[in-house]
Interface confidence: low
């Protein structure tokens, strides 16, 4: 089955610059299929723009200004690129690549889409580092005790643009865990978002990862925020111990090897 | 020019209650085209649901039913038993691929129909309320409540900033919510929730027993033990401090 990946979740440009959007095809040989590009402008219908066929023929939708879009493909990397020249406000949109995929049954085809790349045009000069800055919250003792479950919360702040994807995995697993998230919120010139994961007691002793995809992540790779295991065995204390919680008790944990 | 027009821009559906989306074709006979349905979820993922001639995307056949009403020039998509996973924008699109003619392989889309999923009507359930802290950051976690209407207050004398709460459907078909804020006096922040004309406090859920949960630090981590000599095992830390751990990446 054909699969399309658009590695850029977003692409931020200033006016009149050139944007290059990538689409990586897997499961199908790129030189044996046509790749289509669509755009969805805010509040408008998704519209076909341009395609490049298996033999390299390029077809543009009527009404699309010539010279605006350029499409090509690189068989060596199984990639199709949509180049948008001289970007302007009306180019703000989410751009999807797509291809027809044949089903097992003869004559049955479906069109599959990539996850999309949002083109953002800004006139702002932002700070050098506008990648998401994480803060982690670990389960409260009350929750683990009363509900035999624990909630991890991953807060991401001070990022730009607003396009971000967050998912959760256990440390040694590729399974994406069911999590919940708040809306992306504007804070001054940047954005914040949080996501939380509730796990049953039996999973609290496993390490969990909050995985964040953002255009401005360092080196363009997904940021992984490590949540350490929680030990939940109960230690009963002899009252004579005189070990009640002291208001001045502090815990300093230097977490190592957790940099993304 | 042909146009695909959804019946509604927004359709609220209840979990488990069948819902029908309709999309009419203007300017052409629907029978001259193949109809497709897609769902776009948070994060822009466009997933194929259905194409005429009984083609369904993976995982959609059991819970979705596509149909064409030739007489009314309508495409119909039924969601047989909606769940919270079905929230998203639904798009009808048409093509003539396989019907001959030139350049028939592009899709023409209609505008999306936003499907919002609400829990089924059910007995009222009081929330559980927990506070999580890290530095100046405080999160109030409100779990498993119904109905949705709720007010979450983080109680503090030294507020820096607060954010609107996120209210989402829980896997069990009730609601969960989180409210976040930053406070100079985060240690003393509590959370009170108004729900169903009652007030619930995070302090109602604080564990009164003298017991300890804890993080298991790796060997490379340093832990500073409380100064009291309590003869506890070496790497135990008070859970009261667990969610005040700072992490800078």
């Amino acid at each position: 089955a054909g699969h399309l990946e658009q590695p850029q979740i977003s692409s931020t440009k200033t006016l009149s610059k050139t944007a290059r959007l990538e689409c990586v095809v897997s499961g199908i040989t790129i030189s044996a299929t046509s790749v289509y590009w669509y755009r969805e402008r805010p509040g408008e219908v998704i519209q076909f723009l341009v395609s490049i066929s298996y033999d390299g023929t390029v077809r543009k939708e009527s009404g699309i200004p010539s010279g605006k879009f350029e499409v090509d493909r690189i068989p060596e990397t199984s990639t199709s690129t949509l180049t948008i020249h001289n970007v302007e406000k009306q180019d703000i949109a989410t751009y999807y690549c797509a291809l027809w995929e044949a089903q097992q049954e003869l004559g049955k085809k479906i069109k599959v889409f990539g996850p999309g790349t949002k083109l953002i045009i800004t006139d702002k000069q932002l700070d050098a580092d506008v990648s998401p800055k994480p803060t982690i919250f670990l389960p409260s003792i009350a929750e683990t005790k009363l509900q035999k479950a624990g909630t991890y919360l991953c807060l991401l702040e001070k990022f730009f643009p607003d396009v971000i994807k967050i998912h959760w995995q256990e440390k040694k697993s590729n399974t994406i865990l069911g999590s919940q998230e708040g809306n992306t919120m504007k804070t001054n010139d940047t954005y914040m978002k949080f996501s939380w994961l509730t796990v049953p007691e039996k999973s609290l002793d496993k390490e969990h990862r909050c995985i964040v995809r953002h255009e401005n992540n360092k080196n363009g790779v997904d940021q992984e925020i490590i949540f350490p295991p929680i030990k939940t065995d109960v230690i009963t204390m002899d009252p004579k111990d005189n070990c009640s919680k002291d208001a001045n008790d502090t815990l300093l944990l230097q977490l190592t090897n957790t940099s993304a | 020019a042909i146009e695909l027009v959804p019946e509604h821009q927004t359709v609220p559906v209840s979990i488990g209650v069948p819902a029908t989306l309709r999309c009419s074709m203007k300017g052409e006979a629907i029978g001259n085209y193949y109809i497709n349905w897609y769902r776009k979820t948070q994060g822009n993922t466009m997933t194929f649901i259905y194409r005429e001639k009984d083609i369904y995307g993976p995982g959609f056949k059991d819970n979705f039913q596509g149909d064409i009403d030739i007489a009314k020039n309508l495409a119909v998509l039924k969601i047989l038993a909606p769940s919270e996973r079905d929230e998203g924008s639904y798009y009808c699109a048409c093509d003539t691929l396989g019907m001959g003619g030139e350049y028939t392989d592009k899709l023409i889309f209609g505008k999306g129909t936003r499907v919002t999923v609400e829990p089924r009507s059910q007995p009222h359930t009081k929330p559980s309320v927990f506070v999580m802290k890290n530095g100046t950051n405080v999160a109030c976690l409100v779990k498993e409540f119904y109905p949705k209407d709720i007010r979450i207050n983080l109680v503090s004398s030294k507020k820096i900033t607060e954010f609107d709460p996120a209210i989402v459907i829980s896997p069990s078909g009730k609601y969960n919510a989180v409210k976040l804020g930053k406070y100079e006096d985060s240690n003393s922040v509590t959370c009170s929730v108004q729900h169903d004309n009652k007030t619930v406090h995070s302090t109602d859920f604080e564990v009164k027993t003298d017991s300890t949960d804890h993080v298991k630090p790796k060997e490379t981590e340093n832990t500073k033990q409380p100064s009291k000599s309590c003869h506890k095992p070496k790497a135990i830390v008070h859970t009261e401090k667990v969610n005040m751990m700072s992490l800078t990446v």
């Epitope: - | 019946e7 821009q9 927004t10 609220p12 069948p18 209407d149």
Partner: antibody
């Protein structure tokens, strides 16, 4: 108790536009549909469209499509209805009304705003 | 659009007597979710409308129990068991099953 308070009466020339506001107080705003309904003198009620502020998505009656714009400002709990290319037959009282969603009854109504279109 | 037809146009009634207003829709108001989204509103002279009944027969909070709604499919009725002076005004039915929302033309209730 929830109240919807509308802006004052307007007198407009044909061809111009009018923008009527509707401010909600005393309850949640974002998760309710705010509909706009008009009533010409001595006539019945006519639904123009509505908005769900939390999603910022508006629905319009076909009759008004292209001429009406309904918006909402969540920060001030205010909904707006702008009607352009006014003609004399747009003279009416314009009401905003709140409902749990488009399907349920409109349970809270504004006091109405009289818009007179006259040359 | 769904056409909502109300009868009678005007209904003169004696105080303390019952009154009945009919509403017929041009097509079924049963939604795909199984509900019928028909409501009744009252508009007293010089006031905005007020919700009386939603989903055919559910009385809105604060509405006296002398008001009752009934019906199914395309035919609906609002009954007032004993008319009081404050009930004078125009009554509208409204459907919200199909887009766009549409109202009946109204029935004027007046005292004989």
């Amino acid at each position: 108790e929830v109240q919807l308070v509308q802006s004052g009466a307007e007198v407009k020339k044909p061809g111009s536009s009018v923008k009527v506001s509707c401010k909600a107080s005393g309850g949640t705003f974002s998760s309710y549909v705010i509909s706009w309904v008009r009533q010409a003198p001595g006539q019945g009620l006519e639904w123009m469209g509505g908005i769900l502020p939390i999603l910022s998505t508006a629905n319009y009656a076909q009759k008004f499509q292209g001429r009406v714009t309904i918006t909402a400002d969540k920060s001030t709990s205010t909904a707006y209805m702008e009607l352009s290319s006014l003609r004399s037959e747009d003279t009416a009282v314009y009401y905003c009304a709140r409902a749990h969603d488009y399907y349920y009854g409109m349970d809270v109504w504004g006091q109405g705003t009289m818009v007179t279109v006259s040359s | 659009d769904i056409v909502m037809t109300q009868t009678p146009l005007s209904s003169p009634v004696t105080l303390g007597q019952p009154a009945s207003i009919s509403c017929r829709s041009s097509q079924s108001l049963v939604h795909s979710d199984g509900n019928t989204y028909l409501s009744w509103l009252q508009q007293r002279p010089g006031q905005p409308p007020r919700l009386l009944v939603y989903k055919i027969s559910n009385r809105f909070s604060g509405v006296p129990d002398r008001f009752s709604g009934s019906g199914a499919g395309t035919d609906f009725t609002l009954k007032i068991s004993r008319v009081e002076a404050e009930d004078v005004g125009i009554y509208y039915c409204m459907q919200a099953t199909h887009h766009p929302l549409t109202f009946g033309g109204g029935t004027k209730l007046e005292i004989k």
